[in-house]
């Protein structure tokens, strides 16, 4: 609290060291998600427990589809309000085609670069959203083995909302993306029923991710 | 500097199998950033894509080819491996290995593959 | 399956010339998927542009590539005597994988 009596943020150096991450979310925005409000919303709670800034941790967003868009860089903002603002303002592309390995290569060669922000030494946290099997899952073992050959932590996360719109059998997909979060895959792979039930992992997800740091 | 040569019998007998094996150098293939693949030939033709396969032992084929083809890698050998069965004289080709990563950037010289009785 | 279509089927030019080669896709394909390789007469390919128009190693600056979604463009500014050969485009973004059927660069 500060003379004035006004609650004041004040970071000791220990604890502001043990928040420095890198984050990239990697979101996919294929013509299939559907509501994309649900996927703002998620982001919005994610983000709003974070602690952003240039000397903690710092968040890029990427969206993909048949294209890969980078929709901010890791260090395009520099606190959580800011990057809230931005983070609502993103509208899905959309495309017939989901690249997943594309989305995934891109933001290890491109996001997680010094030019884009990225800081050497800061461990390095995808989050990968995916409703729907990738078209290009042929070049998933190399996109995978280049980001744990650079140490990038994976978080993945299947919709399975257009599966059960349409009583489809998730199993393929599950398996797809169970293969893209690092392991042990069951501390980084996350499946909600549908896109709406998005915010219910948020708090776990939040959780997992800054326990990177412990 | 990385190269790949294809070895295996130049004719083969319809129904049989063809089989080929291409050998690595300068380099080990179970770095993960690679796939190693087989590619065709047709005489005086265009280029086919048979499939390829990851260190870990992922295969990938065309669908066109799958029922037929095996591809396999033995890493301790550093070689991966082509079998092709019930072939016929629409499978006369030219077969290349390659590496591929952002496109096929390393391949072996080719080898004539010629199905006759 | 993704079918590529190259066109001409020969181009006959002089050293010297400018060459523009054409590949079009049956469907929307991501330029980080679509690659050019060069082959001659009893030789394998060689890889000269990833990415659509990233140059390989090694490769001279007079060959560039250009185009999205379902055209794409290899160009060769200035021929060299060493250019004349066939040309394939290729696509890895969905299997399988594809080639064009190639275009012959041939001396006029």
């Known amino acids: 609290v500060s003379p004035t009596f006004q609650v004041v943020n004040s970071i000791a150096p220990v604890q502001e060291c043990s928040t420095q991450l890198d984050i990239v979310i990697v979101l996919d925005g294929s013509n299939s998600i559907y509501p994309w409000d649900s996927v703002t919303a998620f982001l919005n709670d994610l983000l709003e427990r974070m602690d952003i800034g240039p000397k903690q941790t710092q968040v890029g967003i990427v969206q993909y589809g048949e294209n890969v868009t980078h929709e901010f860089n890791l260090n395009k903002y520099s606190s959580t309000e800011e990057v809230l603002v931005a983070a609502k303002k993103i509208g899905r592309r959309g495309g017939l085609q989901t690249m997943t390995a594309l989305g995934i290569d891109t933001a290890r060669k491109e996001a997680f670069t010094e030019a884009r922000g990225a800081r050497r030494g800061v461990k390095k946290v995808m989050v990968i959203v995916t409703d729907g099997e990738s078209h290009d899952n042929h070049r998933l073992k190399k996109v995978i083995q280049d980001c744990e050959d650079e140490n990038i932590q994976r978080f993945s996360i299947a919709i399975l909302g257009s599966y059960n719109r349409g009583n489809l059998s998730t199993e393929k997909f599950v398996e797809e993306i169970k293969s893209i979060a690092s392991e042990p895959t069951e501390k980084h792979f996350f499946n909600v029923s549908d896109e709406l039930a998005l915010v219910t992992i948020v708090k776990t997800l939040g959780e997992r991710i800054f326990a990177l740091e412990a | 500097q990385v190269q790949l040569q294809e070895s295996g019998p130049g004719l083969v007998k319809p129904s049989q199998t063809l089989s080929l094996t291409c050998t690595v150098s300068?380099?080990?293939?179970?770095?993960?950033?690679?796939?190693w693949s087989w590619i065709r030939q047709h005489p005086g033709k265009g280029l086919e894509w048979i499939g390829y396969i990851f260190y870990s032992g992922s295969t990938y084929y065309n669908p066109s080819l799958k029922s037929r083809v095996t591809i396999s890698v033995d890493t301790s050998k550093n070689q991966f491996s082509l079998k092709l069965s019930s072939v016929t004289a629409a499978d006369t080709a030219v077969y290349y290995c390659?590496?591929?990563?952002?496109?096929?950037?390393?391949w072996g010289q080719g080898t004539t593959v010629t199905v006759s009785s | 399956e993704i079918v590529l279509t190259q066109s001409p089927g020969t181009l006959s030019l002089s050293p010297g010339e400018r060459a523009t080669l054409s590949c079009r896709a049956s469907?929307?394909?991501?330029?980080?998927?679509l690659v050019w390789y060069q082959q001659k007469p009893g030789q394998a390919p060689r890889l000269l542009l990833y990415d659509a128009s990233s140059r390989a190693t090694g490769i001279p600056d007079r060959f560039s590539g250009s185009g999205s979604g379902t055209d794409f463009t290899l160009t060769i500014s200035r021929l060299e005597p060493e250019d004349f050969a066939v040309y394939y485009c290729?696509?890895?973004?969905?299997?399988?994988?594809?080639f064009g059927g190639g275009t012959k660069v041939e001396i006029k």
């Open positions: 390659a590496r591929d990563g952002y496109g096929m950037d390393v």
């Open positions: 469907q929307s394909v991501s330029s980080s998927y």
């Open positions: 300068g380099g080990s293939i179970s770095r993960g950033n690679y796939y």
């Open positions: 290729q696509q890895y973004g969905n299997s399988p994988l594809t």
